[in-house]
Interface confidence: low
């Protein structure tokens, strides 16, 4: 039950995270004009990864896409790439994780296959989240750099020199959405990886069977069977005792005719 809950919760958290990453990528308010030092009160500028917008005091807003790559910082292109990679990986991860969900039955898919798919989707979510966090952080760093550059430029460029002065920009709402969404996707991925360990039967536990043979009292307790999934190890072939209460996610094997060889 715990594994199913962990897997389901991981899926939902990742789904919300990826939706957030998509929203952040599409949002226009990645950076907004710093109103504290705004030389123009009539116009408020803000921009995203794909277009730039101007909102007037009247409420009229007009947005214009970046139709050319010329003049756009290389870092902005890198941020775009990171966000797109994050979305693509996240989308693939979601697709894989749907089929990996324990509550969904697809043919005669074994638990080991579901475990592998859960792990794959988990890793994809982790990488997706990291891509989003990295993209937003690179953009934020670029803004901070430009913020201080602009402040410095205000006091330079005298003596007839041609000087481009940049207005200050500060963090937009999309940055915070991106950070939170990336974090959620990352957490969801970790939860999927944790759920994967519970899905993969590391050892098949047999109930102890007592029987008499030739007048001698023998308690037969088979050693742990190592699953070929590659998760964990049981090198010491330790004895496994029945702990009593078990969850529905644990493998429960009962004695069969093969136990009485």
């Amino acid at each position: 039950m715990a594994v199913t809950a962990c897997q389901g919760l991981g899926f939902v958290v990742s789904l919300i995270g990826i939706a957030g990453i998509i929203a952040a990528t599409c949002m226009d308010q990645w950076s907004t004009q710093d109103l504290y030092n705004n030389p123009v009160t009539a116009v408020f500028n803000y921009q995203g990864l794909w277009r730039s917008c101007v909102r007037e005091s009247s409420g009229f807003t007009e947005c214009r896409g970046y139709f050319t790559l010329l003049g756009l910082p290389a870092m902005l292109q890198a941020v775009r790439a990171l966000m797109i990679v994050g979305i693509v990986l996240g989308a693939i991860g979601l697709l894989v994780s749907i089929f990996a969900l324990k509550c969904i039955r697809i043919g005669s898919m074994e638990d080991s296959a579901k475990a592998n798919m859960t792990l794959t989707s988990g890793i994809m979510f982790i990488v997706s989240g990291l891509c989003a966090i990295a993209g937003v952080s690179v953009f934020a760093n670029m803004l901070v750099t430009n913020f201080w550059m602009s402040t410095a430029n205000m006091y330079t460029g005298m003596g007839g020199m041609v000087q481009t002065v940049q207005t200050r920009y500060t963090f937009g709402a999309a940055l915070f959405v991106g950070w939170v969404a990336g974090g959620l996707t990352l957490i969801g991925g970790v939860m999927m990886c944790i759920a994967c360990r519970g899905l993969a039967p590391e050892e098949t536990n047999y109930k102890a069977v007592s029987y008499h043979a030739s007048g001698h009292s023998v308690a037969y307790k088979p050693g742990g069977f190592k699953a070929s999934t590659g998760f964990g190890s049981n090198t010491k072939n330790k004895k496994i005792y029945d702990g009593g209460a078990r969850t529905e996610d644990e493998v429960q094997s009962y004695p069969s005719k093969h136990d009485y060889v």
């Epitope: 004009q33 500028n45 921009q47 730039s52 101007v54 007009e62 214009r64 970046y66 139709f67 050319t68 010329l70 003049g71 756009l72 910082p73 902005l76 430009n146 481009t164 002065v165 940049q166 207005t167 920009y169």
Partner: nanobody, 114 residues
Framework: EVQLVESGGGLVQPGGSLRLSCAAS????????MGWFRQAPGKGRELVSR???????NYADSVKGRFTISRDNSKNTLYLQMNSLRAEDTAVYYC????????WGQGTLVTVSS
């Protein structure tokens, strides 16, 4: 690299005309917001006129009917035609472009005096 270079400023008598030019490089003037701002001695910077990428134009109330903003896409240049100049129009005029960030030229001085 994005750069803006203004020209056309100078001394002019009240009622006279001037045409300011702003040569842009690093982007196309038709694909972004561009505008003219001015800063009179001891005063803050104010918006004179703005032209959006789509062609929408705005003017400050004080210059409506006297100033005309335009752009030449082939020359990648923004213009400000100033007619019926007054003494209060004396200021440093800045060309500005909003292309992912705000970019400003170095400014050109316009003096209206008799």
């Amino acid at each position: 690299e994005v750069q803006l270079v203004e020209s056309g400023g100078g001394l002019v008598q009240p009622g006279g005309s001037l045409r300011l030019s702003c040569a842009a490089s690093g982007f196309t003037v038709s694909s972004t917001y561009m505008g003219w701002f001015r800063q009179a001695p001891g005063k803050g910077r104010e918006l004179v006129s703005r032209i959006a990428g789509g062609g929408q134009i705005n003017y400050a109330d004080s210059v409506k009917g006297r100033f005309t903003i335009s752009r030449d896409n082939s020359k990648n240049t923004l213009y400000l035609q100033m007619n019926s100049l007054r003494a209060e129009d004396t200021a440093v005029y800045y060309c500005a472009a909003h292309y992912w960030m705000d970019y400003w030229g170095q400014g050109t001085l316009v003096t209206v005096s008799s």
